[in-house]
């Protein structure tokens, strides 16, 4: 059941030539690093998880989403200092008692070996070698991502 | 003080021709509505503020940032129902005892006339006619934004 504003929006949009969509990110903005089909930005400063999420959002990007173990390893290879921790887009959902990516999907238990507790106010950080559960209030660095590949007619389904 | 990874990233990027930056959003993706130099997406579903922030982020967008009263009015004109509330990217910072946009800037007190309390766990919603402080846990709709204007050499300073 759509509101009139949503119907209107859909009508306006569907009357367009749909090939005039966002051309995607053709190459990475300055200061961002390319890793396969993504651009990554490793922060210089520190923030709690929530502020890190907000920072990525205002950069029109997302806290890092990691698809599988292979992507984790390739990301960790970019981290030069063993002791530095970076927030990624994964935190503990108390209501669902599970690790949840910020895109709404749940963690496949085989993907990451998390060190630490799965409990309220826990968020996930990565280092050069490991994946850690930390209090979300901990102030550490973070990683933002942008999708690199040009996408035509990219539709964003409502979550 | 930059880490080796960041120095490396800067070196790689600066050696490029800087005109090969992201071309920006040439027009709005399907389902998004154009409002001046922005694309807006009004959600169909409901979420607490934090999940709304995460949703916009995974869409490589931001919760709505409103520059001034004029932009507020133009946004409100797109809302058809007087009672429906939409989260925007503004919440109460307890440590700074002030309303703070997710981009880190503080609210100019003249911009929005907020109805309700300025206190911990308060986030800002807009309706067709007003601006309200609500508990951040309240599950309402939300508005994501993408900047529309093509920008060359867009640099994202670390917050």
């Amino acid at each position: 059941q759509k509101s009139s504003i949503e119907k209107c929006s859909v009508d306006i949009q569907q009357s367009r030539n749909k090939t005039t969509e966002r051309p995607g990110l053709l190459n990475c903005p300055i200061y961002w690093q390319q890793l396969r089909e993504k651009c990554l930005l490793f922060s210089h400063t520190v923030n709690p998880w929530n502020n890190s999420l907000a920072d990525c959002s205002t950069k029109e990007s997302s806290l890092l989403l990691i698809r599988d173990k292979d992507e984790l390893i390739h990301t960790q290879n970019l981290i030069r200092d063993k002791a530095i921790l970076f927030w990624i887009g994964l935190n503990f959902s108390l209501s669902e008692k599970n690790w949840k990516w910020i895109n709404g999907s749940f963690l496949n238990s085989n993907d990451l070996e998390i060190r630490g507790d799965a409990k309220e106010n826990s968020c996930i950080s990565i280092s050069q070698t490991s994946v850690y559960s930390e209090y979300c209030s901990t102030e550490i660095r973070w990683i933002c991502q942008k999708e690199l590949t040009p996408v035509r007619n990219k539709v964003y389904p409502d979550s | 003080q930059k880490s080796s990874i960041e120095k490396c990233s800067v070196d790689i990027q600066q050696s490029r021709n800087k005109t090969t930056e992201r071309p920006g959003l040439l027009n709005c993706p399907i389902y998004w509505q154009q409002l001046r130099e922005k694309c807006l997406l009004f959600s169909h579903t409901v979420n607490p503020w934090n999940n709304s922030l995460a949703d916009c982020s995974t869409k490589e967008s931001s919760l709505l940032l409103i520059r001034d009263k004029d932009e507020l009015i133009h946004t409100q004109n797109l809302i058809r129902d007087k009672a429906i509330l939409f989260w925007i990217g503004l919440n109460f910072s307890l440590s700074e005892k002030n309303w703070k946009w997710i981009n880190g800037s503080f609210l100019n007190s003249n911009d929005l006339e907020i109805r309700g309390d300025a206190k911990e766990n308060s986030c800002i919603s807009i309706s067709q006619t007003s601006v309200y402080s609500e508990y951040c846990s309240t599950e309402i709709r939300w508005i994501c934004q993408k900047e529309l204007t093509p920008v060359r050499n867009k640099v994202y300073p670390d917050s």
Epitope: S95 | V46, K82, I84, L85, S137, E139, R141
Partner: antibody, heavy 122, light 108 residues
Framework: QVQLVESGGGLVKPGGSLRLSCAAS????????MSWIRQAPGKGLEWVSY????????AYADSVKGRFTISRDNAKNSLYLQMNSLRAEDTAVYYC???????????????WGRGTLVTVSS | DIQLTQSPSSVSASVGDRVTITCRAS??????LAWYQQKPGKAPKLLIY???ELQSGVPSRFSGSGSGTDFTLTISSLQPEDFATYYC??????????FGGGTKVEIK
């Protein structure tokens, strides 16, 4: 069609328990704040409890706090009210009601069930 | 808790009459007010929300006004199907969500 159907009412002795259910259909149940509202015979309306769409936020009227528990199962499109330590003054028709979507905790009840009668008497 | 006082408690009117019911809140509630119609043995029906917004499918002879503490429901031209009890309800974001005592609209 869009509807709410309550069940589970009946006669119960003071101190007893009942569990009311409300089956929702015809709309996306998981997007709505849901409430229980009651009406004693010949009297006015009294809001009892609400639950947020995700189930994360719950509130109760003082008259039932500590005795009644609201819950929901979005997968089953169902709302529940567990009523314990029932008293004679809990006798009423109990309505399941949906709030207008996206008005948050400003609850306007736009869809009601037909109600189920709970009688507490010895 | 916010108390709502409706007046009158009952009103006798004829078909075609203009009927006005008032609702006063014990403290300011901005525009967070609704009006419902209830017929005997039936569930209430939402007529007006946000003080003045007409709910979808409700005839335009019903209208609402007011903000703060004083609110009014007006039926511009009473129809036979409008004889019922009417309740106001405050919808500030803090429970409890109180209802007024009701106004019975009867046939004169």
């Amino acid at each position: 069609q869009v509807q709410l159907v309550e069940s589970g009412g009946g006669l119960v002795k003071p101190g007893g328990s009942l569990r009311l259910s409300c089956a929702a259909s015809g709309f996306t149940f998981a997007n709505y704040y849901m409430s229980w509202i009651r009406q004693a015979p010949g009297k006015g309306l009294e809001w009892v409890s609400y639950i947020s769409p995700s189930g994360a936020t719950i509130a109760y009227a003082d008259s039932v706090k500590g005795r009644f528990t609201i819950s929901r199962d979005n997968a089953k499109n169902s709302l529940y009210l567990q009523m314990n330590s029932l008293r004679a003054e809990d006798t009423a028709v109990y309505y399941c009601a949906r709030s207008l979507m996206a008005t948050g905790t400003h609850l306007y009840f736009d869809l009601w069930g037909r109600g189920t009668l709970v009688t507490v008497s010895s | 808790d916010i108390q709502l006082t409706q007046s009158p408690s009952s009103v006798s009117a004829s078909v075609g009459d203009r009927v006005t019911i008032t609702c006063r809140a014990s403290s300011g509630i901005s525009s967070w007010l609704a009006w419902y119609q209830q017929k005997p043995g039936k569930a209430p029906k939402l007529l007006i929300y946000a003080a003045s917004e007409l709910q979808s499918g409700v005839p335009s002879r019903f209208s609402g006004s007011g903000s703060g503490t004083d609110f009014t429901l007006t039926i511009s031209s009473l129809q036979p199907e409008d004889f019922a009890t009417y309740y106001c309800q405050q919808a500030t974001s803090f429970p409890p969500y109180t209802f007024g005592g009701g106004t019975k609209v009867e046939i004169k």
